[in-house]
Interface confidence: low
């Protein structure tokens, strides 16, 4: 089976991704997230499906989920705003904005990430960084420290082939290659970063990880700029 991190990746440099968030349910990692403003974290709407009766919080400034780190802080969530068109049985509009109980204390290890506002596809083959605390192998092992992997963007036509995602990839979604290197369970809601800019959010639909015929699917944030702005306003 694929070895290493995320799937086929490696441990991230500690605190080198200060925008990275862990969305937590009852104190345990549930999904990834990305700090997009001082008081707002962007994640995936489906992550809340698991959280019906639990307490959702956001961990910022973390590398290790378990070890004490000076920059780590757990924030309560004041408001959860899933995209109004997100539905349990589709991957479309799979975005969630979480308003923290207070503005995050910013510093070297906690800083919002600029997000793409120009609604244009990332060029196929572009190497993008995806990070998360999701499972790192097919036996389901979860890491304690943040993992990352570089993935080439895959063109939509290939991703929509019958053998791949069979037409499910709309203009508001994008794909990245998944041949043994991939995002997986627990990475949902995390950022796909291309050239230092947030381009995509890991979708949380059911998908086998690490299989080249089932590329990773990411929600294109530029396609939702108006909605994000309206919520953050």
């Amino acid at each position: 089976p694929p070895r290493g991190r995320i799937l086929g990746g490696r441990e991230a440099e500690a605190h080198a991704r200060p925008y990275m968030a862990s969305v937590q349910l009852n104190g345990a990692h549930l999904c990834g997230g990305v700090l997009v403003a001082e008081q707002w974290v962007l994640s995936a709407a489906h992550c809340l499906e698991d959280a019906a009766d639990g307490k959702v919080q956001v961990l910022l400034g973390a590398h290790s989920l378990s070890q004490p780190e000076p920059s780590k802080r757990l924030y309560d969530v004041l408001r959860a705003v899933p995209h109004p068109d997100s539905q349990p049985d589709t991957i479309d509009h799979d975005l969630l904005l979480l308003q923290l109980s207070e503005k995050a204390t910013l510093g070297p290890a906690v800083r919002p990430l600029p997000w793409q506002r120009v609604d244009r596809d990332v060029a196929p083959g572009t190497l993008c960084d995806v990070a998360g605390w999701g499972i790192v192998n097919h036996a389901g092992r979860r890491p304690d420290s943040l993992q990352h992997v570089l993935l080439p963007v895959l063109d939509r036509a290939t991703c929509n082939r019958r053998t791949h995602h069979d037409g499910a990839i709309t203009e508001r979604l994008m794909c990245a290659e998944s041949n043994r290197r991939d995002s997986c369970k627990g990475d949902s809601g995390g950022p796909l970063v291309c050239g230092g800019v947030l381009e995509g959010v890991v979708t949380s639909g059911s998908r086998v990880c690490g299989n080249r015929k089932k590329p990773g699917i990411y929600t294109r944030v530029a396609s939702y700029a108006a909605w994000i702005d309206s919520v953050l306003a």
Partner: antibody, heavy 116, light 109 residues
Framework: EVQLQQSGAELVRPGALVKLSCKAS????????MHWVKQRPEQGLEWIGW????????IYDPRFQGKATITADTSSNTAYLQLSSLTSEDTAVYYC?????????WGQGTLVTVSA | DIVMTQSQKFMSTSVGDRVSVTCKAS??????VAWYQQKPGQSPKALIY???YRYSGVPDRFTGSGSGTDFTLTISNVQSEDLAEYFC???????????FGGGTKLEIK
């Protein structure tokens, strides 16, 4: 080395309950899903359910809802299967296993015999 | 519920032959299929996950293929130690529910 050591064979009366254990070594069960699988004599495999020991979350096959209860004790690195209201239909070997996209490691099995 | 059907309960083959064990899902399961080998008196052993990925240590004469509803485990150059029952298994990616096929017993002539 990864190992799943299951408790010994059980002979139980109809209507009683039994609790089987599966002690893991070589890994921390908090990092994996732990499953239980039933195999009746000369028959196939039936998945009972799984537990995520880190948070106690469980999922069961609907056929075993109310019959089986899966728990885990992370301090002893052990998963448990409790079976209630036993009947002859529950006579089987019960396996614990570990995994997500496939069950990579299995215990040696525990034979439960229900007999008056 | 998804049903996994292994229509051949028994298959007979000879050492050195190539044999294919088949499994049919009642609905599309993508590539969410694993294969197991169970020798008499032993626990099952995992061979294949995600339809075609071999577990480490599994001989490369075991090959998995298929997607959607039809899946095949092929054993090329069958050895006497391959005498066993073979089970397919499907799993939903969420919330990770599992179903086994009824099994196919491989007999060596």
């Amino acid at each position: 080395e990864v190992q799943l050591q299951q408790s010994g064979a059980e002979l139980v009366r109809p209507g009683a309950l039994v609790k089987l254990s599966c002690k893991a070594s070589g890994f921390n069960i908090k990092d994996y899903y732990m499953h239980w699988v039933k195999q009746r004599p000369e028959q196939g495999l039936e998945w009972i359910g799984w537990i995520d020991p880190e948070n106690g979350h469980t999922i069961y096959d609907p056929r075993f809802q109310g019959k089986a209860t899966i728990t885990a004790d992370t301090s002893s690195n052990t998963a448990y299967l409790q079976l209630s209201s036993l009947t002859s239909e529950d006579t089987a070997v019960y396996y614990c296993s570990r995994g997500l996209l496939g069950f990579a490691y299995w215990g040696q099995g525990t034979l439960v015999t229900v007999s008056a | 519920d998804i049903v996994m059907t292994q229509s051949q309960k028994f298959m007979s083959t000879s050492v050195g032959d190539r044999v294919s064990v088949t499994c049919k899902a009642s609905q599309n399961v993508g590539t969410n299929v694993a294969w197991y080998q169970q020798k008499p008196g032993q626990s099952p052993k995992a061979l294949i996950y995600t339809a075609s990925y071999r577990y480490s240590g599994v001989p490369d004469r075991f090959t998995g293929s298929g997607s959607g509803t039809d899946f095949t485990l092929t054993i090329s150059n069958v050895q006497s130690e391959d005498l066993a029952e073979y089970f397919c298994q499907q799993y939903n990616s969420y919330p990770h529910m599992y179903t086994f096929g009824g099994g196919t017993k491989l007999e060596i002539k």
